[in-house]
Interface confidence: low
Amino acid sequence: AGPAAAVLRELRCVCLQTTQGVHPKMISNLQVFAIGPQCSKVEVVASLKNGKEICLDPEAPFLKKVIQKILDGGNKEN
């Protein structure tokens, strides 16, 4: 996957459902939304190479380490 950043979401949770079985090679960009006052769970939004955006399960094995790295000290953008 390409660049990733922990992003502060605006006012509410972003993901209401997650998509399973996405191959990492299909992902061009990852946004990780940290837990905060707007939403009580970590959320992951993937931009795919076909232009679509989907929500991924942050518990997916291939994502866990990436997410932890981002949340522990990576970039944060508003």
Partner: antibody, heavy 119, light 113 residues
Framework: EFQLQQSGPELVKPGASVKISCKAS????????MNWVKQSNGKSLEWIGV????????SYNQKFKGKATLTVDQSSNTAYMQLSSLTSEDSAVYHC????????????WGQGTSVTVSS | DIVMTQSPSSLSVSAGEKVTMSCKSS????????????LAWYQQKPGQPPKLLIY???TRKSGVPDRFTGSGSGTDFTLTISSVQAEDLAVYYC?????????FGGGTKLEIK
């Protein structure tokens, strides 16, 4: 085919409570939030609140806190809304509506349940 | 709460004409994180529940005829029907989908001459 089937019309007395249901079919019930919307007398729409059927978590419009209570029964793929301490102001058609995913909007709506509060 | 204001409240047009209706929000509906506008449009025909036409301000829901187009950003949005058909007789609502509580406009009633 996606369907949200709501319970039938209700005639209730002031001060009473009513519980209306919304049975989902044709999709994975726990994968989509369920919204409830009030429509008074053919007028505009008021969002009451939303429930996440997977976790039972809710968010309410402040205006309807204490008035509406949202619940789900995962085993029957059914969402419920209970309205309490009813007054004539609560007479309306109430819709359940499935919430979409990444970009929001409510993509499927129940046919509506008419609630009439009258003594 | 975000206030949604629609205009006109009603309009009457002949079949085949182009129609535009406006929706203004009291706060921006643009999410700066993903540069998307959280604005939806619904059509409600007499005796029916609302039906989603447009979400994300401009994305047509699957199955919605391409004569319906949503546009705009921030606080000003427009729904255009390029060539009105008799079956488009309905009330059209816009909805703030950016922040809780979700709020709806008062609606634009479209009548066919």
């Amino acid at each position: 085919e996606f369907q949200l089937q709501q319970s039938g019309p209700e005639l209730v007395k002031p001060g009473a409570s009513v519980k209306i249901s919304c049975k989902a079919s044709g999709y994975s019930f726990t994968d989509y939030n369920m919204n409830w919307v009030k429509q008074s007398n053919g007028k505009s729409l008021e969002w009451i609140g939303v429930i996440n059927p997977k976790y039972g978590t809710t968010s309410y419009n402040q205006k309807f806190k204490g008035k509406a209570t949202l619940t789900v029964d995962q085993s029957s793929n059914t969402a419920y809304m209970q309205l309490s301490s009813l007054t004539s102001e609560d007479s309306a058609v109430y819709h359940c509506a499935r919430g979409m995913g990444l970009l929001f909007g409510m993509d499927y709506w129940g046919q509506g349940t008419s609630v009439t509060v009258s003594s | 709460d975000i206030v949604m204001t629609q205009s006109p409240s009603s309009l009457s047009v002949s079949a085949g004409e182009k129609v535009t209706m406006s929706c203004k929000s009291s706060q921006s509906l643009l999410n700066s994180g993903n540069q998307k506008n959280y604005l939806a449009w619904y059509q409600q025909k007499p005796g029916q529940p609302p039906k989603l036409l447009i979400y994300g301000a401009s994305t047509r829901k699957s199955g919605v005829p391409d004569r319906f187009t949503g546009s705009g950003s921030g606080t000003d949005f427009t729904l255009t029907i390029s060539s009105v058909q008799a079956e488009d007789l309905a009330v059209y609502y816009c909805q703030n989908d950016h922040s809780f509580p979700c709020t709806f406009g008062g609606g634009t009633k479209l009548e066919i001459k």
